[in-house]
Every structure is written in structure tokens, then in C-alpha cells.
Interface confidence: low
């Protein structure tokens, strides 16, 4: 099973490098590297680095396996984040004394600013930072559906942890739905899994930026760690390009 | 972007066909096609055809996407099925009047007959035939854990259906666990999703071979349609071969 | 699996994932990607001999199918199996952008 | 996608899934597989031109990356993307066996 052709490893490496040059520009739909003339001096803004790190870090519940990618997914996705509506907002008033759940509301207009059209959205993740905890709990996520009804989205078994840990839930369908509706406040409910016969239905999980004892942290550095939506979307100008070249080869 | 080499399509097809000859024998770990000398005359037994059809048909909740396959998964898996313990068995007595759940028990010794060693099991699916239904319901599956405790395994949102439909749950880990323990009766619970504030926790889903009004069907043709475990496992003799050649290339 | 754990620590001649770090500045002459400075792109390389099952005794050939031609291809090829995305930060004018590029990092290879 | 829907209804010269039905009896001379009698194995075929980005203007080249070399390989290759298993029934002695063979049917291809 030997092969007589000797492989020029250096040539292969260089061909791979040159192909990557084209691949990156192609994924970003750039004909040449972007001009750096207007780039402000100094380091990257904190918020941008935080967003980059959010994207880079694998979090609990995220899959590392690649899916066969549809054509549109070949192109780069712009990553933005939309923070949960501030806990001091009146909308949270009626949810204060519910022990089995915590609530997270989002302003659809903030989401629409990041993703102007529903089809542009390729992924939306709800990210929550869970504080350290010595108990195991089975939790569930719901989407606000109508005035008093909630639609089940998913669940997770949370094991004890010594350090804060980020949780991620895929909420792409939900956010796309919100974008298809008018502006307004939409929300999620994060609940204890209530069994048919169990009596203790209290949520024992503390979420950064929500759990009562942390409420004083808002406006401080912890504000960055309150629940947020991580959005991945095709930028509008790139999508128009994609749409106009939808013919094959 | 034209290529100057003309492709001999017939040669490619022949090479593909010849490669498939080797591939099938290789996956079955056969050095040559098996002798047909002892094959009984007549058509295939009903039960074998039913099993073949169960394997062939994609069912609700099963993924069509291929996973990157570990080495052992390259080889063929023998498919067997183990029916749920008969509903007339005394073990079901104490579960009769529970409205939020139905119960399915299995004899570990039946499973062990099909899969003598836990590592041989590559997939186990619990298959249930849901009867036609006009209601939507969110259901959950649990594994019997200890005397009175149940471990959550998964959930499904069941939409209305005009025809009976097969449901499939991946229970590979659970069955492997059972094989690691001694013989005995083990079980699953199929429940309504009980929310923290909802009052109606009744299971509205009817399962063939379980739901009370169908109990008279047992022992008839419907017996084939009562809940069963579909097991895919490496046959013992093939596994020993695999184990002895675990060195690379 | 023909992954980084196995391939980077062996001298496998056949299909395997090979190490390749790309420094955006040195290798591509690019300073416009602000983060990361480079990444482990890696690549797949090595023969996947075509196994013509009648050419030799089955017993010798069958054991080779799993690695060399598991898909029974007419001309098997060493290609990526597991891939990972790469997030980058760059500027468009004065505006920083974070974008995720899919399938950029090769973690393992296979004969396909 | 380079799947059966697109490829079987077009005259695509580049990488695509090609039709191939295998009749166990006629094509392999086998009578020992009782079910099925054959199956649509299909296969991948067609060039994936290597795109050397400096050989021509970027604008002409970049649009081709998506199909011809999305993985930025040094030598892209037309290989299966989506595969499906094949269950078979055969006898060992007097005992019928149902076995599932993984990744036997090619549903779509890709340049990788």
C-alpha cells in the first residue's frame, strides 16, 4: 500500500495557506482586505473583546460537531449581543414572588437593530451565567407565548459546580418568531422542573444579574454578565449579495 | 475550471461496485459470502420481516444526519427486539390508577440474551406506537431508578395525528446500565409534562398495547405493536475479532 | 480516530490530520484581523489506498477497509471529518465587528 | 446542495452525487442477502478545482470558493456529505439475521 509519489509537504502547506487567504475573504464577501485607514488607535473596546470571548468559548450545552452546512451558512456570521431588559424595569414587578422560576425579558427593537430581517438570523443563543451551587437541579426553559401562557423550549440537568458557569440554550426559532412580529417586550422563563407528584418545586439555581442578592450589582462590571442573547446573523449587505447570486455556479 | 482528463464513468462505477463488495463483507467481518446450504425454504419469517421493517423505517425523533463514526461503528450491527413484559404481569398492578403516566417494564435477562456484554451494545431505542389523537401534549420519559424514584430521560411535544405513529427514544445509556447490573425487571415511565402551576396533569396519549381500552388486544396481531426495545449490537464473535485486531493498520 | 491526539503524536504516513498554524501577519500579510493573531487551521494529508477487493485474498484486504476505504469509494480521498468554527474581530471603517467563520479548524480526518 | 434532487436532474460536470443502483444478484453475483434485493448506493464524482487566489482577480475567484473549495483544501476532493445506513437480512446457517450497515447510501456530496 505504499505510494511512490513523494509529497512536497511545504508546497501542500503553502497551497493550504493560499486557499485560506481566499476562503476568509470569500466567507466575508470581501474582494480585498478592508482598509485600515479609519481604525481608531489603541486596544479593542472592552465590549468587543467580551463579545469575541463569548463567541470563542464553548459553553455548557453547545455542540462541537459540525452539521452539513447549507450554502448560506458558508458565509461569515456577524456576532452581536442583546442584554436582557434591566431588572429595575416595571415589567419584572409581577414575577418577584414566584419561587419556581426566574424571568428574562428582551426588547424586540434591540434585537431588530442587530438583525433587521428574520431570514438573516442564523443562530440565537440565550446565555445565562449560573453562580456556584452545591445542589443538582433539573431546570426548564419556556418562551412567553401569550398573556399568561408559556411554551416549553428545553431542559437541562444542572450538576453542582464550584465556579460560575455559562449555560447556553438555542433559541433561534423563538427569536426569528419575535422578529416576525411587531416590536415589544418578549421573554423567557427559567424554571425548576416540576414533577407530577413532587412537592418541592423551588428553583435553587442562582443566575448572575437576576438572583435577588445580586440585584445591587447592576450597573457595575457584573452588568456584562447578566443574561443576554448571542445573535449570529448575515449582515444585510452581504445577504443582498447572496440573494442576487443565488444561481448555481 | 475545466478538467482535461476525461472520466471513464463505467470504470468508476465498476470500481465503486467492487469496493462495495469488499465493504459489505468487511462490515460483516466475513472473509467470503456465507454458505446458503442450510437456509430453510420458503419466505422469511414474519417476525424477521417486521424487525427488518422497523429498522428500515425512519421514525419520529430519529436523526437522519450521520455522526462522525467511531471505529467500532464501522462494522455491521445485529438488530434484535425485546418486547415489553406482558401487561398481565403482576408488576403492573400498582401502576393501574395513575392518570399522569403509563409504565413499561422489561426483563433484563431477555435483553442480555440479545446482548451478552454491555460494550457490545451500540444503540438501544424504546419504540412506542402512539394511537391517533386529536390533542397536543408535552410528554416525558423517565427511567426507574430505585424503589420509588425515577430519573428524567427526555421529552417530546406530540402534535395531533390522524394515523398511528411510532415514537422512538434513544435509551442506549440506560440499557447499557441495566446490562451492567444483575438480572431483574427494569422499567420506563411515560408521563404528561407536569408544569409548576398547571392543574391538569393527565396523560392524554394512548400507546398501543398499554392503554386500558386496548388491553384485550394482547396475544393478537397487535402484540407485535406493543412497546419494545430495538437493539443494535455487535455480535459476540465479531466483537472478539474486533478486540484482537485493535492495533492500528 | 485520525484526530489531533493520534496524528500529532505519531508518524502516520497514511491519511491523518497535519499541524498547521497560520499567523495572519506572517503567513498572509494581514494586519486587519485584530483577534485572533492566528489559528491552528491544520489540514488533511496522506494516501487512502483504493482497495480492489478481488486483487488479493479477502482476509488480507478486509482489515484495511475500515481505515483506507470505509465508504467504498472508487477513489478514496483524505478529507476533514470534524471541523470547528473561528470567530474573528476586524474593523469596517471605524466600526469593530465580531464574525464567526464556520468550518475553519480541522480537528480530524477520514478517508472518504 | 449537491444532493440527489439537484444532481440527478442536472448535467453538472463538477462534483455531484451520481446515480448507482446495485442489484446484489446481478452486480455482485450474491444470492445470500435476502432483503433488500439491491439498493441505491450512488457515488460522488466530478472535479473540485483548486482555487489559487492570486492566479486571477479576486472578484472572479471568490464566488467559486463556496462550491469548489469551501474547506480551503490544498487539493479539494469530491466526497460524500450525507450518508444513510442500509439494513439487510441474511442467514448464518439456519438462523436469519437482521443487521444494519452504517453509511452505505450516498445522499449528497461536497468538495472537501
Amino acid at each position: 500500500l505504499s505510494t511512490c509519489k513523494t509529497i512536497d509537504m511545504e508546497l501542500v502547506k503553502r497551497k493550504r495557506i493560499e486557499a485560506i487567504r481566499g476562503q476568509i475573504l470569500s466567507k466575508l464577501r470581501l474582494a480585498s482586505p478592508p482598509s485600515q485607514g479609519e481604525v481608531p488607535p489603541g486596544p479593542l473596546p472592552e465590549a468587543v473583546l467580551a463579545l469575541y470571548n463569548s463567541t470563542r468559548d464553548r459553553v455548557a450545552g453547545e455542540s462541537a460537531d459540525p452539521e452539513p452546512e447549507p450554502e448560506a451558512d458558508y458565509y461569515a456570521k456577524e456576532v452581536t449581543r442583546v442584554l436582557m431588559v434591566d431588572r429595575n424595569n416595571a415589567i419584572y414587578e409581577k414575577t418577584k414572588d414566584i419561587s419556581h422560576s426566574i424571568y428574562m425579558f428582551f426588547n424586540t427593537s434591540d434585537i431588530r437593530e442587530a438583525v433587521p430581517e428574520p431570514p438573516l438570523l442564523s443562530r440565537a443563543e440565550l446565555r445565562l451565567q449560573r453562580l456556584k451551587s452545591s445542589v443538582e437541579q433539573h431546570v426548564e426553559l419556556y418562551q412567553k407565548y401569550s398573556n399568561n401562557s408559556w411554551r416549553y423550549l428545553g431542559n437541562r440537568l444542572l450538576t453542582p459546580t464550584d465556579t460560575p458557569e455559562w449555560l447556553s440554550f438555542d433559541v433561534t426559532g423563538v427569536v426569528r418568531q419575535w422578529l416576525n412580529q411587531g416590536d415589544g417586550i418578549q421573554g423567557f422563563r427559567f424554571s425548576a422542573h416540576c414533577s407530577c407528584d413532587s412537592k418541592d418545586n423551588k428553583l435553587h439555581v442562582e443566575i448572575n444579574g437576576i438572583s435577588p442578592k445580586r440585584r445591587g450589582d447592576l450597573g457595575t462590571i457584573h452588568d456584562m454578565n447578566r443574561p443576554f442573547l448571542l445573535l449570529m446573523a448575515t449582515p444585510l449587505e452581504r445577504a443582498q449579495h447572496l440573494h442576487s447570486s443565488r444561481h448555481r455556479r | 475550471l475545466s478538467t482535461c482528463k476525461t472520466i471513464d464513468m463505467e470504470l468508476v462505477k465498476r470500481k465503486r461496485i467492487e469496493a462495495i463488495r469488499g465493504q459489505i463483507l468487511s462490515k460483516l467481518r466475513l472473509a467470503s459470502p456465507p454458505s446458503q446450504g442450510e437456509v430453510p425454504p420458503g419466505p422469511l419469517p414474519e417476525a424477521v420481516l417486521a424487525l427488518y421493517n422497523s429498522t428500515r423505517d425512519r421514525v419520529a425523533g430519529e436523526s437522519a444526519d450521520p455522526e462522525p463514526e467511531p471505529e467500532a461503528d464501522y462494522y455491521a450491527k445485529e438488530v434484535t427486539r425485546v418486547l415489553m413484559v406482558d401487561r398481565n404481569n403482576a408488576i403492573y398492578e400498582k401502576t393501574k390508577d395513575i392518570s399522569h403516566s403509563i409504565y413499561m417494564f422489561f426483563n433484563t435477562s431477555d435483553i442480555r440474551e440479545a446482548v451478552p456484554e454491555p460494550p457490545l451494545l451500540s444503540r438501544a431505542e424504546l419504540r412506542l406506537q402512539r394511537l391517533k389523537s386529536s390533542v397536543e401534549q408535552h410528554v416525558e420519559l423517565y427511567q426507574k431508578y430505585s424503589n420509588n424514584s425515577w430519573r428524567y430521560l427526555g421529552n417530546r411535544l406530540l402534535t395531533p395525528t390522524d394515523t398511528p405513529e411510532w415514537l422512538s427514544f434513544d435509551v442506549t445509556g440506560v440499557v447499557r446500565q441495566w446490562l451492567n447490573q444483575g438480572d431483574g425487571i427494569q422499567g420506563f415511565r411515560f408521563s404528561a409534562h407536569c408544569s409548576c402551576d398547571s392543574k391538569d396533569n393527565k396523560l392524554h396519549v394512548e400507546i398501543n398495547g398499554i392503554s386500558p381500552k386496548r388491553r384485550g388486544d394482547l396475544g393478537t396481531i397487535h402484540d407485535m405493536n406493543r412497546p419494545f426495545l430495538l437493539l443494535m449490537a455487535t455480535p459476540l464473535e465479531r466483537a472478539q475479532h474486533l478486540h484482537s485486531s485493535r492495533h492500528r493498520r | 480516530a485520525l484526530d489531533t491526539n493520534y496524528c500529532f503524536s505519531s508518524t502516520e504516513k497514511n491519511c491523518c490530520v497535519r499541524q498547521l498554524y497560520i499567523d495572519f501577519r506572517k503567513d498572509l500579510g494581514w494586519k486587519w484581523i485584530h483577534e485572533p493573531k492566528g489559528y491552528h487551521a491544520n489540514f488533511c494529508l496522506g494516501p487512502c489506498p483504493y482497495i480492489w477487493s478481488l486483487d488479493t485474498q479477502y482476509s488480507k484486504v478486509l482489515a484495511l477497509y475500515n481505515q483506507h476505504n470505509p465508504g467504498a469509494s472508487a477513489s478514496p480521498c483524505c478529507v476533514p471529518q470534524a471541523l470547528e468554527p473561528l470567530p474573528i474581530v476586524y474593523y469596517v471603517g471605524r466600526k469593530p465587528k465580531v464574525e464567526q467563520l464556520s468550518n475553519m479548524i480541522v480537528r480530524s480526518c477520514k478517508c472518504s | 446542495a449537491l444532493d440527489t434532487n439537484y444532481c440527478f436532474s442536472s448535467t453538472e460536470k463538477n462534483c455531484c452525487v451520481r446515480q448507482l443502483y446495485i442489484d446484489f444478484r446481478k452486480d455482485l453475483g450474491w444470492k445470500w442477502i435476502h432483503e433488500p434485493k439491491g439498493y441505491h448506493a450512488n457515488f460522488c464524482l466530478g472535479p473540485c478545482p483548486y482555487i489559487w487566489s492570486l492566479d486571477t482577480q479576486y472578484s472572479k475567484v471568490l464566488a467559486l470558493y463556496n462550491q469548489h473549495n469551501p474547506g480551503a483544501s490544498a487539493s479539494p476532493c469530491c466526497v460524500p456529505q450525507a450518508l444513510e445506513p442500509l439494513p439487510i437480512v441474511y442467514y448464518v446457517g439456519r438462523k436469519p439475521k437482521v443487521e444494519q450497515l452504517s453509511n452505505m447510501i450516498v445522499r449528497s456530496c461536497k468538495c472537501s
Partner: antibody
């Protein structure tokens, strides 16, 4: 230390041919992209041709395309420029230059080492 | 006609700062490199990738690029800095490396 020494220049009539050589030392020649640059008397620098480290890819200025051929022999650490159908406007000092980076296309990169040059005069 | 435009001459007093500019081509997107050439000698790289100095080049040499203009700065010019300075970049429309016409620096 890095050295590049050009040779092969001289006087040639229009329509004639000449082959320039550049002997390299002090670095791993086979890893680097190499370039020929020329300078007409009293004028600026003009890029002529570049070649990939393995010789697999070659690039030419429009003014010399079809007449000049760049090549290399990595076993001998030598770069060549075969010049045919020479014209009076090809009169210049021809420099051989090494790219600053490995794995890198010279189209974008600086050239960190240059030879002293060899004069080519095309005149009748 | 060069694809990159440089002033043909720049004069500077000894010890003062000299600035040579280079415009055009694809300088909005691609790096600039600078070479010094003395009469009868080969060019010498003094700045590469806009602002990187090769070893052996004095610290008084620096470079920058903003928008479509690259600038070579000599802070405290010395008599030895006299010569012709060429900028070099890539022109994406020609798909080729390009040089400026050269700037003769005189130190007074």
C-alpha cells in the same frame, strides 16, 4: 549571512535572448518566494517577475509577459530569468530579491535582501 | 507613470524630521514597504509592513499608513540618510506589486 549574486547580463541586440542567474546563499532558498526587479538608467524600480518557492506558480509584469520566463533550481539554490525577443526598453540593471516571509506571496510582502544587480543593455 | 505617487524631492535640515509620502494603488488595503537606494548600490529595505523596522535599521526610521497614504518618517535626519527612497505595495487592479517613482532626500 544572506547573499544574492546576479550574473549573465551584457550587451545584446534587439530581438536577441539572454539568461540571467542569481546564486543564493545564507538562507533556505527553497522556502522563499523570489522576485526580479529592474531599474532603467536614471529611473525608478519596476517589478518584472516572481516565482513561488517550489516553482509551481509564476507571475509576470504585463510589459514582459510572453517574452520572459522565470524559473528556479532549488537543488542548486539558483534563480533564473530567461529573456527572449529583447527590446531597447528592457535595458536596465536587473536585481534579484528575496521575499521577507516564508509561506507568503511576494505580491504583498517586502523584499529584505537584494543582489547588487547585473546590467542588461539592448542596443543595435 | 507609477501606480504609487511620491514627491520627487524632499529636503530637510540636518537633525530635523523628514517626511516622505506615498499615495495610490491599493494602499487603503495593503501594506507599504520602503527602500533606500544610494547611487550605484542596490536598494535596502528600511521599513516593511507599514511600520516594522528590519534589524540594523536605525530607530529614527519609522512608517505609518492611514487611508490611502503611507508615510516614511526620519526623525532627526543624518547626512548618511541621503539617497532615493522608494515605496512599494500591491495594486489589486493590476494584480501586481508596484513601486513609487522614488523621492530624492537631501539633508542640508
Amino acid at each position: 549571512q544572506v547573499q544574492l549574486v546576479e550574473s549573465g547580463g551584457g550587451l545584446v541586440q534587439p530581438g536577441g535572448s539572454l539568461t540571467l542567474s542569481c546564486a543564493a546563499s545564507g538562507f533556505t532558498f527553497s522556502n522563499y518566494y523570489m522576485t526580479w526587479v529592474r531599474q532603467a538608467p536614471g529611473k525608478g524600480l519596476e517589478w518584472v517577475s516572481s516565482i513561488y518557492s517550489t516553482g509551481s506558480h509564476t507571475y509576470y509584469a504585463d510589459s514582459v509577459k510572453g517574452r520572459f520566463t522565470i524559473s528556479r533550481d532549488n537543488a542548486k539554490d539558483t534563480l533564473y530569468l530567461q529573456m527572449n525577443d529583447l527590446k531597447s526598453e528592457d535595458t536596465a540593471v536587473y536585481y534579484c530579491a528575496k521575499n521577507i516571509y516564508t509561506y507568503y506571496t511576494a505580491h504583498y510582502a517586502g523584499m529584505d535582501y537584494w543582489g547588487k544587480g547585473t546590467l542588461v543593455t539592448v542596443s543595435s | 507613470q507609477s501606480a504609487l505617487t511620491q514627491p520627487s524631492t524632499v529636503s530637510v535640515s540636518l537633525g530635523q524630521m523628514a517626511r516622505i509620502t506615498c499615495q495610490g494603488g491599493s494602499l487603503g488595503s495593503y501594506d507599504a514597504h520602503w527602500y533606500q537606494q544610494k547611487p550605484g548600490q542596490a536598494p535596502v529595505l528600511v521599513i516593511h509592513d507599514d511600520n516594522s523596522r528590519p534589524s540594523g535599521i536605525p530607530e529614527r526610521f519609522s512608517g505609518s499608513r492611514s487611508g490611502g497614504t503611507a508615510t516614511l518618517t526620519i526623525s532627526g535626519a543624518q547626512a548618511d540618510d541621503e539617497g532615493v527612497y522608494f515605496c512599494h505595495s500591491y495594486d489589486s487592479s493590476a494584480n501586481a506589486p508596484v513601486f513609487g517613482g522614488g523621492t530624492e532626500l537631501t539633508v542640508l
